[in-house]
């Protein structure tokens, strides 16, 4: 078979939740290996994910470094096999990623209600605070750690015999709601970030209805 | 010119502990994986690790993970390997390498250690 | 971790005759590279990414092969070309050398 020339990455795209941080592009390599390059905008290109036939790179070890700082990365096409570079002077064909900046833009991950507990008319429903892949002095931070009053929960939640449903909002990860007595509710949850202009919500966590496992009730 | 400039050699008894030195020059030091490579005598090429400098970073072969430390001193563009536990069949030529794509190819002229008691 | 098994471990040729020498890898490798070491000497990037020669080595050499099985080609021996020669894997970690295979005046 005839030679053929390296191609160039391209669609490179930051797929990003809760901090876990993968670039992904194509095409599926024929004749050739890429190796990912990450770098802040004032520091180094350092070489990741080398010589590889994958078309997609975790990066996240280097962005929970410092998740509010904005990261470029660029996948690197090199010749493996019959192919001719066609980069110029031997240098190997690149492209670069947009900017990614891991505070601003990480998605949200579908949260967890963690319990719920009724006493009399009130219930407290708790947030399940998710463990995150951001280190600080050697012990991963939560999502509440990371994002502080800027991350906020909002509670849905609904009799279960009508389908009318109330909002209530927590900048902690837990609601304390009135209910009226007697009655079964359900309850969902949804994280967001008010001041973001993109990725501002999560999905809607799982359903949880009293009368199920998760609950507790007290006279 | 990229240069890197190792240590000289090593006489060490069975047991003792050595550090091998590796000065780059020539470039941004902290911007390339360093390779370290030994050689045994009449061998062929072992490939022992490489480190980040600007972070520290390693990748070790799980082969030397109880026994070899990568290190690096940015101040002073110097990359080390220490290997302690040393044993007769540590006797090797060892070599820093630069991390390069293509025909870039940098190389120390190796420091040989010779382990005997 | 991927053992690189080369052979011959000896190769006895003349200037002008042709060396073939083999690099056969214990599971699928897409990464491959050549050096070339004469005595005394450091290595010296030869042939990367299988096929590509390294700045400054002749035309008279070529490399090839995918999967499992790689060679390097030397089509007319001249004596500069006689040392050994080590193919290594960057495909996966921990990178892996072959045993070598020196090349040596008949």
């Known amino acids: 078979s005839g030679t053929t020339n390296t191609v160039a990455a391209y669609n490179l795209t930051w797929k990003s939740t809760n901090f876990k941080t993968i670039l992904e592009w194509e095409p599926k390599p024929v004749n050739q290996v890429y190796t990912v390059q990450i770098s802040t905008k004032s520091g180094d290109w350092k070489s990741k994910c080398f010589y590889t036939t994958d078309t997609e790179c975790d990066l996240t070890d280097e962005i929970v470094k410092d998740v509010k700082q904005t990261y470029l990365a660029r996948v690197f096409s090199y010749p493996a096999g019959n192919v001719e570079s066609t980069g110029s002077a031997g240098e190997p064909l690149y492209e670069n990623s947009p900017e990614f900046t891991p505070y601003l833009e990480t998605n949200l991950g579908q949260p967890t209600i963690q319990s719920f507990e009724q006493v009399g008319t009130k219930v407290n429903v708790t947030v399940e605070d998710e463990r995150t892949l951001v280190r600080r002095n050697n012990t991963f931070l939560s999502l509440r750690d990371v994002f502080g009053k800027d991350l906020i929960y909002t509670l849905y939640y609904w009799k279960s015999s009508s389908s009318g449903k109330k909002t209530a909002k927590t900048n902690t990860n837990e609601f304390l709601i009135d209910v009226d007595k007697g009655e079964n509710y359900c309850f969902s949850v949804q994280a967001v970030i008010p001041s973001r202009t993109v990725n501002r919500k999560s999905t809607d966590s799982p359903v949880e209805c009293m009368g199920q496992e998760k609950g507790e009730f007290r006279e | 010119q990229v240069q890197l400039v190792q240590s000289g050699s090593e006489l060490k008894k069975p047991g003792a502990s050595v550090k091998v030195s590796c000065k780059a020059s020539?470039?941004?030091?902290?911007?390339?994986?360093m390779n370290w490579v030994r050689q045994a005598p009449g061998q062929g090429l072992e490939w022992i690790g490489m480190?980040?400098?600007?972070?520290?970073?390693?990748r070790l072969n799980q082969k030397f993970k109880d026994r070899a430390v990568l290190s690096v001193d940015k101040s002073v563009s110097t990359a080390y390997l220490q290997i302690c536990s040393l044993k007769a069949e540590d006797t090797a030529v060892y070599y820093c390498?630069?991390?390069?794509?293509?025909?870039?190819?940098?190389w120390g002229q190796g420091t040989t250690v010779t382990v005997s008691s | 971790e991927i053992v690189l098994t080369q052979s011959p471990a000896t190769l006895s040729l003349s200037p002008g005759e042709r060396a073939t020498l083999s690099c056969s890898a214990s599971?699928?490798?897409?990464?491959m590279n050549w050096y070339q070491q004469k005595p005394g000497q450091s290595p010296r990037i030869w042939i990367y990414g299988i096929s590509n020669l390294a700045s400054g080595v002749p035309a008279r050499f070529s490399g090839s092969g995918s999967g499992t099985d790689f060679t390097l080609t030397i089509s007319s021996l001249e004596p500069e070309d006689f040392a050994v020669y080590y193919c290594q894997q960057k495909s996966s970690f921990p990178w892996t050398f072959g045993g070598g295979t020196k090349v040596e005046i008949k």
């Open positions: 020539g470039y941004s030091f902290i911007s390339y994986w």
């Open positions: 599971s699928s490798v897409s990464y």
């Open positions: 390498a630069r991390e390069d794509y293509g025909s870039s190819d940098y």
């Open positions: 480190i980040y400098p600007a972070d520290s970073e390693t």
